[in-house]
């Protein structure tokens, strides 16, 4: 038997993926566990194997279909269960009735690239991945730039309150190495959260021309 507190958190990426994390104090080390998804109004059901991500937490991704297919809507309720093997039987460790569009977390933005770089500014673009057509252009972004000698946590957040998949960073220092990250969030959903940060994009500003400032 398993004692201790259990937490089971899942997010829908708005298309065809539900990602779940299950954490359990006093957890089972060598037990096989899985997440089972059972929608109330769809003909499919899906399972994924929970894999350890730390001492007492496991994660898995329920792949519901092709990455850009719209597999769920606002009226769907998906019963999500954590099942762990106990001998020849499966034991239910956690259960929730999951409303996908109340628990959104989009995929991190992808394809970051430097469009144009100068001595004091840099134009960067990105793309969003697997976001539902329901949102249309109504998304918001946060971006941050890592300066030399600072940490990501110290970086000020830049907020873009519309679906703008580019940014022009200003007042940069010439001939300096920077890193840039962006994340995205839809407007919908009581428990919706920001996407993970994108992979950092490294860039270097141009050196100042001798005798003048560009």
């Amino acid at each position: 038997a398993v004692n201790g507190t259990s937490q089971f958190t899942c997010f829908y990426n708005s298309r065809a993926n539900i990602s779940c994390v299950w954490s359990q104090d006093g957890a089972l080390q060598d037990t096989s566990c899985q997440v089972h998804a059972w929608p109330d109004r769809r003909r499919w059901n899906q399972t994924c194997e929970l894999l350890p991500v730390s001492q007492a937490s496991w994660a898995c991704n329920l792949i519901l279909g092709a990455p850009d297919s719209q597999k769920l809507t606002t009226v769907d309720i998906v019963t999500l269960r954590v099942l762990c093997r106990e001998g020849v039987r499966w034991r239910v460790m956690a259960i929730q009735d999951f409303k996908p569009f109340e628990n959104l977390r989009l995929m991190a933005p992808i394809s970051l690239q430097v469009v144009h770089v100068e001595t004091h500014r840099c134009n960067i673009s990105w793309e969003i991945s697997q976001a539902s057509h329901y949102f249309e252009r109504h998304l918001e972004f946060e971006a941050r730039t890592l300066s030399p000698g600072h940490t990501w946590e110290e970086a000020p957040l830049l907020t873009l309150k519309q679906k703008q998949e580019w940014i022009c960073l200003e007042t940069l220092t010439p001939d300096t190495q920077y890193e840039f990250q962006v994340r995205v969030k839809p407007l919908q959903g009581e428990f919706t959260t920001w996407s993970p940060w994108s992979q950092p994009l490294a860039f270097r500003t141009k050196p100042a021309a001798l005798g003048k400032d560009t």
């Epitope: 769809r42 809507t73 009226v75 407007l187």
Partner: nanobody, 119 residues
């Protein structure tokens, strides 16, 4: 402004058939679900049938096998084909649409259409 307009409600005899229609019109929206609910005096509004994107229909227990919901996403219209009607099907039938407008989802209701089944 979004509008839902129902039509087709009338007086019909037990065992008869009826088709209700509901059309959604107005400013720019995307619908992800459309359906029908009914209300009889003194009772809660109850689900008759709805259909979400992906073609998944859901029916109330009392109408399964007798009623069929059809959704035309291009015309933003939903139909309810009712057959083998009985007096218990009497009530006001309301159309409901789940609409995405400017990145947020809300439910919208029609004014209702009266269906009366006589024995």
């Amino acid at each position: 402004e979004v509008q839902l307009v129902e039509s087709g409600g009338t007086l019909v005899q037990t065992g008869g058939s009826l088709r209700l229609s509901c059309v959604v019109s107005g400013s720019h929206f995307i619908s992800d679900v459309m359906g029908w609910y009914r209300q009889v005096p003194g009772k809660q509004r109850e689900l008759v049938a709805d259909m979400a994107d992906g073609g998944s229909a859901k029916y109330g227990d009392s109408v399964k096998g007798r009623f069929t919901i059809v959704r035309d996403s291009v015309k933003n219209t939903v139909y309810l084909q009712m057959s083998s009607l009985n007096p218990e099907d009497t009530g006001v039938y309301y159309c409901k649409a789940g609409l995405w407008i400017k990145g947020r989802h809300s439910d919208y209701w029609g004014q209702g259409t009266q269906v009366t089944v006589t024995s």
